[in-house]
């Protein structure tokens, strides 16, 4: 079953590497668990970033040693990517899973390009 | 494409029983989704009466108290509603639906109306 | 339960008109509202859900917004086969309710 997926056409990351945008699905009722990962398209190559499980009314849990945090409210999933560098630039898709009850819905994002500056080195000073 | 079809009586006594059944057709009903009943009262009024999952798990609408019984015949593709001690206030159309869980309905049955009256 | 108000019962409207109906909730429902078009002798369509997502094969005329408590369906450019009668549906939360309705008429 297909869902609308909602996100930020574009997004520029802060002078620290971090990026945040909103993930909404268009929720057909209250799936009790929903599956939200983040695939980053570059150069026609896509490769998940991170993924996370989570029950309805819980924190969404990455791994550990995950780049990304985020939070859920209601069918809204609040993203952030930390640790970004200007090479990471590129198009992050919100993929959105309603894992349980069934049936299964997907919903693919159109993505959101964050652009990624490095910071200038700060001079030298005497 | 799904499809839900009631039948059943059109016509009650008060203090007696009604039973109506929902037909669905074009997804097996132990696939997914909730299967629900709706009755709307002359004046266009709507009330949810209750469910039965996919899993066979049940919940019903608590001003309805223990009237109603929701069940299913898996084989038939079919569920049903048994109504207790209905009176005058029972005088609707119902119609069955379906949604996902804690959700909007996206398939109804066309209604059948029910008359309570001795 | 959660009582969703339709405060008007009828709306009177011209072909060509925009017009607003609304539904307020007596509690927080976030976006979990849904609306329906209703005409005599049919079953209720769905038309939005998730607040203002619209159903499949649904005209763009139809358009739905608010969150929390307030609701509004606003249909543009109203065509006469639009006059019927506007459920909006909370489900949030169980026992699943419904406002009483908002019929649209021909002025």
């Known amino acids: 079953k297909a869902m609308h997926v909602a996100q930020p056409a574009v997004v520029l990351a802060s002078s620290r590497g971090i990026a945040s945008f909103v993930c909404e699905y268009a929720s057909p009722g209250k799936a009790t668990e929903v599956r939200v990962t983040v695939l980053r398209q570059a150069d026609s190559q896509v490769t998940e970033v991170c993924a996370a499980t989570y029950m309805m009314g819980n924190e969404l849990t990455f791994l550990d040693d995950s780049i990304c945090t985020g939070t859920s409210s209601g069918n809204q999933v609040n993203l952030t990517i930390q640790g970004l560098r200007a090479m990471d630039t590129g198009l992050y898709i919100c993929k959105v899973e309603l894992m349980y009850p069934p049936p299964y819905y997907l919903g693919i994002g159109n993505g959101t390009q964050i652009y990624v500056i490095d910071p200038e080195p700060c001079p030298d000073s005497d | 494409d799904v499809q839900l079809q009631e039948s059943g009586q059109g016509l009650v006594k008060p203090s007696q029983s009604l039973s109506l059944t929902c037909s669905v057709t074009?997804?097996?009903?132990?696939?997914?989704?909730?299967w629900n009943w709706i009755r709307q009262f002359p004046g266009n009024k709507l009330e949810w009466l209750g469910y039965?999952?996919?899993?066979?798990?049940?919940y019903y609408n608590p001003s309805l108290k223990n009237r109603i019984s929701i069940t299913r015949d898996t084989s038939k593709n079919q569920f049903f509603l048994k109504l207790n001690s209905v009176t005058s206030e029972d005088t609707a159309t119902y119609f069955c639906?379906?949604?996902?869980?804690?959700?909007?309905?996206?398939?109804w049955g066309q209604g059948t109306t029910l008359t309570v009256s001795s | 339960d959660i009582v969703m108000t339709q405060s008007q019962k009828f709306m009177s409207t011209s072909v060509g008109d925009s017009v607003s109906v609304t539904c307020k909730a007596s509690?927080?429902?976030?976006?979990?509202v849904a609306w329906y078009q209703q005409k005599p002798g049919q079953s209720p369509k769905p038309l939005i859900y998730?607040?203002?997502y619209r159903y499949s094969g649904v005209p763009d005329r139809f358009t739905g917004s608010g969150s929390g408590t307030d609701f509004t369906l606003t249909i543009s450019n109203v065509q006469s086969e639009d006059l019927a009668e506007y459920f909006c549906?909370?489900?949030?939360?169980?026992?699943?309710?419904f406002g009483a309705g908002t019929k649209l008429e021909l002025k």
């Open positions: 639906a379906r949604n996902y869980y804690s959700g909007y309905f996206d398939f």
């Open positions: 074009g997804y097996s009903i132990t696939s997914g989704y909730y």
């Open positions: 039965i999952g996919y899993d066979g798990s049940n």
């Open positions: 509690q927080n429902v976030g976006t979990y």
């Open positions: 998730s607040t203002s």
């Open positions: 549906h909370q489900y949030d939360t169980y026992p699943l309710t």
